[in-house]
Interface confidence: low
């Protein structure tokens, strides 16, 4: 197939062809291909035509939509909203070619690289060691440091016990669940509800990459679909990371977490997986998080407290 410009100077902006190569499935747009994508800040006005000699891209709505790279979509992306409820405010306004940049509001901080919510800075009763910054919480002076250490020991002692008890409960329930469903004797899985009760306030944002790693793309899509992420957003994330399914999973889960908020996110995840009969998967995630929390609590936190108090 040859496409040239005739003597009248007709601009051939697009060459329409159809997919013949199987491995290009993910890059397929509306069953057709445009030779030229729309530049940043614009979107496709309509589907590709063989010799579309009119302008084929139109600008995104300033302040409401953007596209930050060349693309073939007929939709611009919606500008990010900096949710005050999550402790965020606008750092840089959305333009046609750049998404909004958010930052923590004054007296809020965020210690993860991608900030989906900021936490309020701790107010110190007995004076400040280190001021709160955008990236770290206030460090407070403590009254009666030594006695606090004993309180800490008492608080931490039951953790391994609780975890052990919970694991036993979980294993029982999941064995029962498996026997009922399959009549088989597989390795124990969890009853997510039992665990969720204990860990409902865990901050999932730091585990999203790990969780994405143990879930398949279809499992992630199924979960986020049922939990408030719309199709447009799912498609957008897919198109942004066409050849990187790992990144698709991370972004889908991040998006769900951002929508859902920190509170009860763990609960929702575990219950959602249980509903979808993904008991083993739920156990994997629970084990990862429990391991991390217990080793954090028992080791690093305990050591750090001893060093700073003794």
């Amino acid at each position: 197939q040859v496409t040239d410009i005739n003597s009248k100077g007709l601009e051939l902006r697009k060459t329409v062809t159809t997919v013949e190569t199987q491995n290009l499935e993910d890059l397929h747009h509306d069953g057709q291909f445009c030779h030229k994508p729309c530049p940043p800040g614009e979107r496709k006005a309509r589907d590709c035509t063989v010799n579309g000699d009119e302008p084929d891209c139109v600008p995104c709505q300033e302040g409401k939509e953007y596209t930050d790279k060349a693309h073939f979509s007929s939709k611009c992306r919606r500008c990010r909203l900096c949710d005050e409820g999550h402790g965020l405010e606008v750092e840089i306004n959305c333009t046609r070619t750049q998404n909004t940049k958010c930052r923590c509001k004054p007296n809020f901080f965020c210690n993860s690289t991608v900030c989906e919510h900021c936490d309020p800075c701790t107010k110190c009763e007995h004076g400040i060691i280190k001021e709160c910054t955008l990236a770290s919480n206030t460090k407070c002076k403590e009254e009666g440091s030594r006695s606090n250490l004993w309180w800490l020991c008492l608080l931490l002692l039951p953790i391994p016990l609780i975890v052990w008890v919970k694991r036993k409960e979980v294993q029982k329930t999941c064995r029962k669940h498996r026997k009922e469903n399959q009549g088989s004797h597989e390795s124990p899985t969890l009853n997510p509800e039992t665990v969720a009760i204990n860990l409902s306030d865990v901050d999932l944002s730091k585990y999203i990459t790990t969780i994405a790693g143990v879930m398949t793309l279809s499992q992630v899509k199924g979960f986020v679909r049922k939990n408030g992420v719309n199709e447009a957003k799912i498609d957008e994330i897919k198109n942004d990371n066409v050849q990187d399914t790992a990144e698709q999973k991370v972004q889908l889960l991040r998006n769900w977490h951002q929508l859902h908020g920190k509170k009860d996110a763990y609960d929702t995840l575990i219950k959602g997986l249980k509903k979808a009969n993904l008991c083993t998967l739920a156990e994997k995630i629970q084990t990862i998080i429990l391991k991390d929390i217990t080793s954090d609590s028992e080791n690093s936190n305990f050591r750090n407290e001893i060093q700073s108090l003794v």
Partner: antibody
Framework: QVQLQQWGAGLLKPSETLSLICAVY????????WTWIRQPPGKGLEWIGE???????NYSPSLKSRVTISVDTSKNHISLNLTSVTAADTALYYC????????????????WGQGTTVTVSS | DIQMTQSPSSLSASVGDRVTITCRAS??????LAWYQQKPEKAPKSLIY???SLQSGVPSRFSGSGSGTDFTLTISSLQPEDFATYYC?????????FGQGTKLEIK
Amino acid sequence: QVQLQQWGAGLLKPSETLSLICAVYGGSFSTYYWTWIRQPPGKGLEWIGEINHRGTTNYSPSLKSRVTISVDTSKNHISLNLTSVTAADTALYYCARGLLWIGEGDYGLDVWGQGTTVTVSS
Amino acid sequence: DIQMTQSPSSLSASVGDRVTITCRASQGIRRWLAWYQQKPEKAPKSLIYAASSLQSGVPSRFSGSGSGTDFTLTISSLQPEDFATYYCQQYNSYPYTFGQGTKLEIK
């Protein structure tokens, strides 16, 4: 890392046919347009034309009657043929990776071959 | 064909200077413009695509701006390795065309 390796006859007589080959190593071959550009001695760059892996071509009108760009997908080769050459075709010929055929993105001519000097002289 | 006109054709500058090269299209090309750097006996190297997007691995002292018919390439603080010839190229409509080049020399 994508690399473009070029070769072909460097010295031609007027009226002969210029033939150059550009081999693509590494990276995706089937999602890009592959472009030929030339640069006469001491002058600027001139776009000759482009092709994708399906053989879809776009040519410069000034060379269209003499130029053929073809593709061999089994070898990831792109070739340039220019018939009836004259001294005006003496130039350094480059192949380059062009606009994405499909998928998101646009990077201009982001990867270039080393260039092949072609001299037309009687 | 769309004519691309670069100015100036040549300029002399010193290390540390801020330099701006302009490129004008004879008709609107939206943001479909690329900038290339070419050193003697070397193939051109892509610096900027889509008028203002920095090519991967290119130092941030290079920046591009403009849309429609008027475009600029700016080097915020010239380094010794930046002395070369710079070309703009439109790829909005066929045939894709290049500017005549701007030779940047040491003062």
